[in-house]
């Protein structure tokens, strides 16, 4: 039902859902810190623009009695319960920040008349694509899928002269929320990825994965998985791997690869890591000092959500436009705003664009090196290392099907 918004007369409120079930196991205190830091920046920016208004955040906590799994499995109802709480208290702000779980976002979007914008740090699944008033500030599954298809088809790079049309996907059900939805998108038979591939099989057991590594009758040399190097080691250990196997490790929210003096372990030599271009150092920031790299991205998305609201508020106020309108609710897309860590671009559907980075392990230096970057905004690949020191034969990525000649 329609809820009156605390969003006029020079006073603008942000409703922040503080859900027990979250895409990342982040103490709510850290998210509060991120939001508060964002508020300080927004107030400064509005003041500098000569806009004398008040911007505050209201943190809406769920009781945590019923929905206490801590992950996203029981988030569907928690989001709706929180919305009911907001509705009963008549405390809706100009914008809703949170939830981060795909289940809850999808359900909330479905079950409410959204005449206000919703900003999410998460909601990675395909079911949250193309939602008119939803903005997602962490790379959704659709962006990953488009990269993979682009990369599979590429055959004109010095280090990749074959297009690929096959893949195994390892998905055992214990994944983190981001990985769960990334792999879910690759698995879905109706997805773009599945549509563009000739062969794709999901490996669900550790043994299935381990057997493929040396199976002469395997149908593809390429295996996609999601997680960090430790996750791969737990699965693969020091097992021998056929020389033309390529493991694509999706580890988007982890900038440990970019830290000084990081050496790639030996088991990473057959692996290409897909991650995001790291932010400028956030370590000096009060909200991020005690966060792991992944959680830093999550907290940063909350902070950027506040900055995005500030950006839109400034534009609408400067133009003398009303904030509590469908126009405002639909405006959080197809734009670039100044985020905490540099410019942030949102696509036509309100999803964050980013630079994805594909890394390889140099056999010479045992260091991670950038092989190529991919700009999700223009769907374009930029090869970086034209002469990579790969483990694969002739320093070229192998064909995806053993024994098949050039195409």
């Amino acid at each position: 039902s329609q809820v009156s918004q605390n969003c006029h007369n020079g006073s603008y409120e942000i409703s922040v859902l503080m859900m027990g079930n979250s895409a990342f196991a982040e103490p709510l205190k850290n998210l509060e810190d991120a939001v508060n830091e964002g508020l300080e920046i927004v107030r400064g920016r509005l003041q500098n623009a000569g806009l004398n208004v008040t911007v505050n955040a209201t943190f809406m906590y769920s009781d945590g009695l019923i929905h206490n799994s801590g992950d996203c499995r029981s988030s569907t109802c928690e989001g709706l319960d929180l919305l009911r709480k907001i509705s009963n208290a008549q405390r809706m702000g100009c914008v809703l920040i949170g939830p981060s779980c795909t289940y809850s976002t999808f359900q909330m979007y479905l079950d409410t008349e959204l005449s206000y914008p919703m900003i999410s740090a998460g909601s990675f699944g395909l079911s949250c694509d193309y939602k008119e008033t939803l903005t997602r500030l962490m790379s959704p599954a659709r962006k990953l899928m488009y990269f993979l298809v682009n990369f599979w088809k590429t055959n004109d790079l010095p280090f990749k002269t074959y297009s690929w049309s096959t893949s195994y996907v390892y998905k055992n059900g214990t994944e983190t929320e981001d990985c769960f939805w990334y792999l879910n998108a690759l698995e879905a038979s109706v997805s773009y990825f599945s549509h563009e591939l000739g062969f794709k099989v999901v490996l669900r057991q550790d043994k299935e994965f381990q057997d493929i590594l040396m199976d002469h009758n395997r149908k593809s040399n390429v295996i996609i998985m999601c997680g960090g190097p430790e996750f791969l080691y737990k699965l693969k250990g020091d097992r021998a791997v056929a020389e033309d196997i390529v493991i694509i490790l999706v580890d988007l929210f982890n900038d440990q690869y970019f830290e000084d003096n990081v050496t790639a372990p030996d088991y990473m030599k057959n692996v290409l890591v897909l991650t995001l271009s790291p932010g400028n150092s956030l370590l000096n920031s009060s909200f991020s000092r005690n966060l792991s790299p992944t959680k830093r991205d999550f907290a940063l998305a909350y902070l950027n959500g506040i900055l995005l609201f500030g950006h839109m508020l400034k534009i609408f106020l400067e133009n003398g436009e009303n904030i509590t309108t469908p126009k405002f609710a639909h405006a959080f897309r197809n734009l670039t705003f100044e985020g905490y860590d540099g410019p942030v671009t949102l696509d036509d559907w309100g999803d964050v664009d980013s630079t994805m980075v594909l890394l390889y392990t140099s056999v010479d230096t045992k260091k991670y090196k950038v092989l190529l970057t991919y700009d999700t905004h223009v769907n374009k690949t930029y090869p970086v290392d034209m002469s990579p020191t790969f483990t694969w034969k002739n320093s070229k990525l192998p064909n995806d099907i053993t024994g098949r000649g050039p195409q």
Epitope: D156, L157, P158, F258, D260, S277, P278, N280, S281, G342, T355, K367, K369, V370, T373, V378, K380, Y382, P383, V384, M386, S387
Partner: antibody
Framework: EVQLVQSGAEVKKPGSSVRVSCKAS????????ISWVRQAPGQGLEWMGG????????NYAQKFQGRVTITADKSTSTAYMELSSLRSEDTAVYYC??????????????WGQGTTVTVSS | QSVLTQPPSVSGAPGQRVTISCTGS?????????VHWYQQFPGTAPKLLIF???NRPSGVPDRFSGSKSGTSASLAITGLQAEDEANYYC????????????FGGGTKLTVL
């Protein structure tokens, strides 16, 4: 305003090496790619290689692979280009240039003043 | 031999319009990569003139414009002035072994 200041002119013997520095001021050094571009007398611009300081590894044009080494010292906001096995055709003005973004495909929007390297016996 | 091909020289009288072409291939301009243009006066460092095919950095007069189509790009200068006499270079990205950053051979613009 961002500025790149390069080290002074060098005269070198064939077979030796030269190391040119490029100090950045007035910006976030790690956030931008640094490229090295050279220009022989009366000739055009030639990209030698570049580095992404936040990542630390360099990439080189095939022509210079094995002969050039590009490094960056984040603590002093300085990039270095070392060219070895010098020959007379390496006589040129060497420029460092900052990309408009982190990656090498960015435009080169800030240039150093250039360092003249003369290779002569 | 430069990866991107430019005419060695072009000329025009003051007030005229001149264009400088930059021809690439399917591995650079034709692959959709942006083209940037630089202006260089003798004895000085190059200066960014046009970026991302057709954008001007602040301070560059709107007499300078860029365009891109297929595997080539061009720089247009209208209302030619004596101070435009300089060398002009195009630059793009390249997917082949010659890459990743490639320049044109340069064009000397003479104002008659």
């Amino acid at each position: 305003e961002v500025q790149l200041v390069q080290s002074g002119a060098e005269v070198k013997k064939p077979g030796s090496s030269v190391r040119v520095s490029c100090k950045a001021s007035g910006g976030t050094f790690s956030s931008y790619a640094i490229s090295w571009v050279r220009q022989a007398p009366g000739q055009g611009l030639e990209w030698m290689g570049g580095i992404i300081p936040i990542f630390g590894t360099a990439n080189y044009a095939q022509k210079f692979q094995g002969r050039v080494t590009i490094t960056a010292d984040k603590s002093t906001s300085t990039a270095y280009m070392e060219l070895s096995s010098l020959r007379s055709e390496d006589t040129a003005v060497y420029y460092c240039a900052r990309g408009g973004g982190r990656w090498l495909h960015s435009r080169l929007d800030v240039w150093g003043q250039g360092t003249t390297v003369t290779v002569s016996s | 031999q430069s990866v991107l091909t430019q005419p060695p020289s072009v000329s025009g009288a003051p007030g005229q319009r001149v264009t400088i072409s930059c021809t690439g291939s399917s591995s650079n301009i034709g692959a959709g990569y942006d083209v940037h243009w630089y202006q260089q006066f003798p004895g000085t460092a190059p200066k960014l003139l046009i970026f991302g095919n057709n954008n001007r950095p602040s301070g560059v007069p709107d007499r300078f414009s860029g365009s891109k189509s297929g595997t080539s790009a061009s720089l247009a200068i209208t209302g030619l002035q004596a101070e435009d006499e300089a060398n002009y270079y195009c630059q793009s990205y390249d997917r082949s072994l010659s890459g990743p950053v490639v320049f044109g051979g340069g064009t000397k613009l003479t104002v008659l």
